[in-house]
């Protein structure tokens, strides 16, 4: 789970072991500020919780190119 | 530890419904679901349907569609099933299990409870 | 809907001996996002393997899971006395669809 470290920045300092089914995410952001130790992506899932992941993952780079492309298709 | 706590066996007449309980208990409800399935004697497993509590709208198998109802009470961790025109086939013993929402092994389970359709 | 079907129905095998459970699903099940349960008679199902190969918390590594796609195997090393049960296996791509196979019978020859 991520924390804030102040009102501004929210830092990952561990990652979710686990591959999240693309279908069980809402959308993402990534975390890239230097006050934080690494760099990550954080997941809101369906259920509006935060998760840590590491953006060196393949399955982490493929679900944020899959929210990116859901999020320009416009619905119809 | 996680328990599911499921009402008592029921007897009831065909056409009748019955309503079974699924409390939980030591472990949070929010970003869980749970899951109703079925075993009639001598047979398989059979999902009915689930719920997420917090999304208030459940999701029933196509064979069960109509006939049956699946809720969560948040203030109280607790589900519930609900089974409409009963009939003899539905003679079976009834499980809740829960679910991580954001994968969905069925990793804790209800005792089962035996709803018996009987004229 | 997804279709599992399980082979063989039963398996008639000797304590020590080894095990091999089969899992067939009419679409690709993605993710990986299949598992196994055990069940005794009397009892409800245990969770044993989850995401096709991850053993649940408590259970022996004698049981191993292996698969992707549409074919999984659920494999018992050695069958202890306390193995001889019926196994499912169980889908959850879809939290709105899940389905179980017909079961597994593991049984003492």
């Known amino acids: 789970q991520p924390d804030a470290i102040n009102a501004a920045v929210t830092c990952c300092y561990n990652f979710t072991n686990r591959k999240i089914s693309v279908q069980r995410l809402a959308s993402y952001r990534r975390i890239t500020s230097s006050k934080c130790p690494k760099e990550a992506v954080i997941f809101k899932t369906i259920v509006a919780k935060e998760i840590c992941a590491d953006p060196k993952q393949k399955w982490v780079q493929d679900s944020m190119d899959h929210l990116d492309k859901q999020t320009q298709t416009p619905k119809t | 530890q996680v328990q599911l706590v499921q009402s008592g066996a029921e007897v009831k007449k065909p056409g009748s419904s019955v309503k079974v309980s699924c409390k939980a208990s030591?472990?949070?409800?929010?970003?869980?679901?749970i899951s109703w399935v079925r075993q009639a004697p001598g047979q398989g497993l059979e999902w009915m349907g689930g719920v997420i509590p917090i999304f208030h709208t459940a999701n029933y198998a196509q064979k069960f569609q109509g006939r049956v109802t699946i809720t969560a009470d948040e203030s109280t961790s607790t589900a519930y099933m609900e089974l409409s025109s009963l009939r003899s086939e539905d003679t079976a013993v009834y499980y809740c299990?829960?679910?991580?929402?954001?994968?969905?092994?069925?990793?804790?389970w209800g005792q089962g409870t035996l709803v018996t359709v009987s004229s | 809907e997804i279709v599992l079907t399980q082979s063989p129905a039963t398996l008639s095998l000797s304590p020590g001996e080894r095990a091999t459970l089969s899992c067939r699903a009419s679409q690709h099940v993605s993710d990986a996002y299949l598992a196994w349960y055990q069940q005794k008679p009397g009892q409800a199902p245990r969770l044993l393997i989850y995401?096709?190969?991850d053993r649940a918390e408590g259970v022996p590594a004698r049981f191993s899971g292996s698969g992707s796609g549409t074919d999984f195997t659920l494999t018992i090393s050695s069958l202890e006395p306390e193995d001889f049960a019926v196994y499912y296996c169980?889908?959850?791509?879809?939290?709105?669809?899940?389905?179980f196979g017909q079961g597994t019978k593991v049984e003492i020859k």
């Open positions: 995401d096709a190969s």
């Open positions: 030591g472990g949070t409800f929010s970003h869980y679901g």
């Open positions: 299990a829960r679910y991580d929402a954001h994968y969905g092994e069925l990793d804790f």
């Open positions: 169980h889908q959850y791509i879809h939290l709105h669809s899940f389905t």
